[in-house]
Interface confidence: low
Amino acid sequence: WELTILHTNDVHSRLEQTSEDSSKCVNASRCMGGVARLFTKVQQIRRAEPNVLLLDAGDQYQGTIWFTVYKGAEVAHFMNALRYDAMALGNHEFDNGVEGLIEPLLKEAKFPILSANIKAKGPLASQISGLYLPYKVLPVGDEVVGIVGYTSKETPFLSNPGTNLVFEDEITALQPEVDKLKTLNVNKIIALGHSGFETDKLIAQKVRGVDVVVGGHSNTFLYTGNPPSKEVPAGKYPFIVTSDDGRKVPVVQAYAFGKYLGYLKIEFDERGNVISSHGNPILLNSSIPEDPSIKADINKWRIKLDNYSTQELGKTIVYLDGSSQSCRFRECNMGNLICDAMINNNLRHADEMFWNHVSMCILNGGGIRSPIDERNNGTITWENLAAVLPFGGTFDLVQLKGSTLKKAFEHSVHRYGQSTGEFLQVGGIHVVYDLSRKPGDRVVKLDVLCTKCRVPSYDPLKMDEIYKVILPNFLANGGDGFQMIKDELLRHDSGDQDINVVSTYISKMKVIYPAVEGRIKFS
């Protein structure tokens, strides 16, 4: 019996087609993805093949103006229109709190939304009961397939799930649910979830009875053969893990932003054992037409967005590189721009001894969600910035000891190379890392811009000195694992809305040209 699994993950509000780098579509003939194009391909496969499941592994929420304006209603509407069979909760589904998940998505979705390792407690337990499930048994042709969900246990550090949701260890939580499915005579089980590729592989290895793992969160691109676009494969598709009980378990993920549709064919024997698996992500490029009825619906929903955000704020004469491939690995000029805007927004001439009260900025690279292409006449709009900074956060002022800053920069590279969001972009700081050293001892140079000076210059960080730093509220609250900031900050003052800070700076500067200038170096 053959099953076709179509899967998406980390779509992040890319309802419309995008450029190849997943930023706003500029040249339509070269654009990719979007729900109208996805629908065309999904329907083509549904027509051609008998047993098809369309699954999403989380993080539909957050990423463009669509989410800023519609707050998840767009996710429910278009996922319903595409007739997804199931979705796992991602960390970003909690970005607007639990209410922002329940009302627009959980109550409106016509498909099951899953997570086995999220447990509700207190008054929330009865309110959310039945709105998401640990698993769902889906009829597919003459057979049934069990789908069990999971969500990153790091979600409390990455989003806003509140205090009444407990995020358990994925493997610990999944095993009893899989066992339950087995007792229900379900012998074909897919783990669908959002914890990253490393955890996906662990689930495949450790959870007895899971036949296939469909993941997300780490934006992992897997491909067998010559990849069709710019993404470099992290391994073959599917990635095969040998489980502790000796089975070959296929693990898949489909990069992100709706650029690809994961396509996995699994053959099961009569006992539900996987006997073969093959496939590849399908690049949703312009050779696939956009479905006219979905496109018309998109255009109808678009009207509200156009009013919101289309006026020009200023111009860029350089490419603003906000790609995860840059900002999570090295200094990127989008990070420099944002940090410069954050400092500029906090210019307060104190007295003759200080040129300013604050000179330093840190910004988690994972908070930068999109590039901006200068080839669109250089125009920068609020909409462009909403794609770069979609989280609706604030840029806050904190006071930290030098020793805390040092810990933060060690944390920035403690697991360097996995495309994780904690890699820091900076302003008013020069940092040098040596990645050959062990984690926790990789910061070999940390110089900070003086404030008590008439001519600003860089001086070595003093561990016992107290410094003012501008940073996202996300970091001040210990997000992305920066617990040391939350625990050790000496003062925290809320600041202005992030997009507004950057848009004001761009409007003020009129024309911008941020460079990569050696703020972050590797020895």
């Epitope: 329907q43 549904r46 027509r47 051609a48 319903n80 229109a81 007739r83 016509k110 009825s293 619906d297």
Partner: antibody, heavy 125, light 111 residues
């Protein structure tokens, strides 16, 4: 029990109108596309019209386009066929049918897996 | 006129294998998938095959479908008296932008 029950058929003069209804039960109505199919006495099946789960896609046979209008009310689990300018050749048993899928256009690997018993429309002067 | 054609009648004896064919064009059968319906005398049609060769639950495996080019066929093995019925093929037609049914084949079980 999954069931479709048609009503509204009858004897009508040429040029007049008739509205057929189909009441659905036993399944989640708004998860599926729906169709009207007719069968003239002693003849074969003819697809008349279809409508997607959310009414976004609608299709008609050439023989009825411009005269017939299909609609649905998901809140009432009901499908309708408004038939105007009726002709003698519209005389048939009209079946309401549930699709296995939710879309209408070209998703033809899905079949019509539940049918009503039909309602008779006779157009005669 | 019917854009998808079927032979008007077919027959067979109990236990025999019979095949009913359906012929169309590139705009219907050639480019899309085929469904088959059975209509017993005096009853509503019943879906027998979808997606060229897939049986809904409850349909015996004596019924099988296939498609090649612009033609499709329904095979019934181990013919039984209760198989006496009208059989219709159906497909989406890209030119007409709608579903089309074949003219139907009346199957008679002899003896």
């Amino acid at each position: 029990e999954v069931q479709l029950v048609e009503s509204g058929g009858g004897l009508v003069q040429p040029g007049r109108s008739l509205r057929l209804s189909c009441a659905a039960s036993g399944f989640t109505f708004d998860d599926y596309a729906m169709h009207w199919v007719r069968q003239a006495p002693g003849k074969g099946l003819e697809w008349v019209s279809g409508i997607s789960w959310n009414s976004n896609s609608i299709g008609y046979a050439d023989s009825v386009r411009g005269r017939f209008t299909i609609s649905r009310d998901n809140a009432k689990n009901s499908l309708y066929l408004q038939m105007n300018s009726l002709r003698a050749e519209d005389t048939a048993l009209y079946y309401c049918a549930k699709d296995m899928g939710w879309e209408l256009l070209k998703t033809s690997y899905y079949g019509m897996d539940v049918w009503g018993q039909g309602t008779t429309v006779t157009v005669s002067s | 006129q019917t854009v998808v054609t079927q032979e008007p009648s077919a027959s067979g004896t109990p236990g025999q294998r019979v095949t009913i064919s359906c012929s169309g064009s590139s705009s219907n059968i050639g480019g899309n998938t085929v469904n088959w319906y059975q209509q017993l005398p005096g009853t509503a049609p019943k879906l027998l095959i979808y997606s060229n060769n897939q049986r809904p639950s409850g349909v015996p495996d004596r019924f099988s479908g296939s498609k090649s080019g612009i033609s499709a066929s329904l095979a019934i093995s181990g013919l039984q008296s209760e198989d006496e019925a009208d059989y219709y093929c159906a497909a989406w037609d890209d030119s007409l932008n709608g579903r089309v049914f074949g003219g139907g084949t009346k199957l008679t079980v002899l003896g």
